[in-house]
């Protein structure tokens, strides 16, 4: 699987999940988020050669087409597959509020 366990341990040029740390205050200007200060959102990147974690028959065909026709611009894209939520804490006045934000952390990628 093209997940953090594999991708973070290997120098993989093809489609894989890559580490990306986002600081809420410095990177996004979200000064009001109290905790966490930031988090690993991660992102997917890298080429999608034939049979590289193909998501659908279409992406398999597209990957094969691109392999056999290297000059063609059409090829599958490396996109998030599994995402996890992130819990944040902020204050409304002096009242703490905890929210779970869905689909915030990329855990694995696929070619689609």
């Amino acid at each position: 699987a093209l997940d953090t366990n594999y991708c973070f341990r290997n120098l993989e040029e093809n489609c894989c999940v890559r580490p990306l740390y986002i600081d809420f205050r410095q990177d996004l200007g979200w000064k009001w988020v109290h905790e966490p200060k930031g988090y690993y959102a991660n992102f997917c990147s890298g080429p999608c050669p034939y049979l590289r974690s193909a998501d659908t028959t279409h992406s398999t065909v597209l990957g094969l087409y691109n392999t056999l026709n290297p000059e063609a611009s059409a090829s599958p894209c490396c996109v998030p597959q599994d995402l996890e939520p992130l819990t944040i804490l902020y204050y409304v006045g002096r009242t703490p509020k905890v929210e779970q934000l869905s689909n915030m952390v990329v855990k694995s990628c696929k070619c689609s």
């Epitope: 979200w30 000064k31 204050y91 006045g93």
Partner: antibody, heavy 121, light 111 residues
Framework: EVQLVQSGAEVKKPGASVKVSCKTS????????MNWVRQAPGAGLDWMGQ????????NYNEMFEGRVTLTADTSTSTAYMELSSLRAGDIAVYYC??????????????WGQGTLVTVSS | DIVMTQTPPSLSVSPRETASISCRAS??????????MHWYLQKPGQSPQLLIY???NLESGVSDRFSGSGSGTDFTLRISRVEANDTGVYYC?????????FGQGTKLELK
């Protein structure tokens, strides 16, 4: 230039609902809380609630809880305020106002032009 | 809810004089070393505009004739050398406690 442009005046019957829009430009919509404030004729300002457009988190004033719904469309950078079960006491000018940015609950540095909502049978 | 009480309800000032508006909160609006109190002016037929942020910080583009002071529960907005353009209703606002609340307003007129 930051701009908040609200929809036009509305006339509604008692018991009906009204939905006011606030189209923004000149800043990154998902970076600031959007507040809604109402002002009855000749009266002061009442904070209704707020929404964080990035994921739709909301905080409401209990005075309006259950009747007001705040939403946001990030694709058009537009915020919406819907008020249901309208009554004569809801006749007011409704403002959208951008939060200052340092806190969730904050001062408001940019305001829409206001939308007059009239309730009449 | 924190109740904000402004005095006086209305004020008539001669041009070039100084006007003072008070705002008293029903409980302290101080937290983490800040006073969560702000001031707005609503000119006739217009939307409110932010003048003072966090009790004493002048908002960008606002004349330095406006100044704010105070902490805890008692705050003051001063307008020096009052001009015709300063007429309107002034509001204080706190955001230390949910819900955010405003004062009832002080109407400033020129003599």
């Amino acid at each position: 230039e930051v701009q908040l442009v609200q929809s036009g005046a509305e006339v509604k019957k008692p018991g009906a609902s009204v939905k006011v829009s606030c189209k923004t430009s000149g800043y990154i919509f998902i970076t600031y809380w959007m507040n809604w404030v109402r002002q009855a004729p000749g009266a002061g300002l009442d904070w209704m609630g707020q929404i964080f457009p990035a994921w739709g988190s909301t905080n409401y004033n209990e005075m309006f809880e259950g009747r007001v719904t705040l939403t946001a469309d990030t694709s058009t950078s537009t915020a919406y305020m819907e008020l249901s079960s309208l009554r004569a006491g809801d006749i007011a000018v409704y403002y959208c106002a951008r939060g200052y940015g340092n806190y969730a609950l904050d001062a408001m540095d940019y305001w829409g032009q206001g939308t007059l909502v009239t309730v009449s049978s | 809810d924190i109740v904000m009480t402004q005095t006086p309800p209305s004020l008539s000032v001669s041009p070039r004089e100084t006007a003072s508006i008070s705002c008293r909160a029903s409980e302290s609006v101080d937290s983490y070393g800040n006073s969560f109190m702000h001031w707005y002016l609503q000119k006739p037929g217009q939307s409110p505009q932010l003048l003072i942020y966090l009790a004493s910080n002048l908002e960008s583009g606002v004349s330095d004739r406006f100044s704010g002071s105070g902490s805890g529960t008692d705050f003051t907005l001063r307008i020096s050398r009052v001009e015709a353009n300063d007429t309107g209703v002034y509001y204080c606002q706190q955001n230390n406690e949910d819900p955010l609340t405003f004062g009832q307003g002080t109407k400033l007129e020129l003599k």
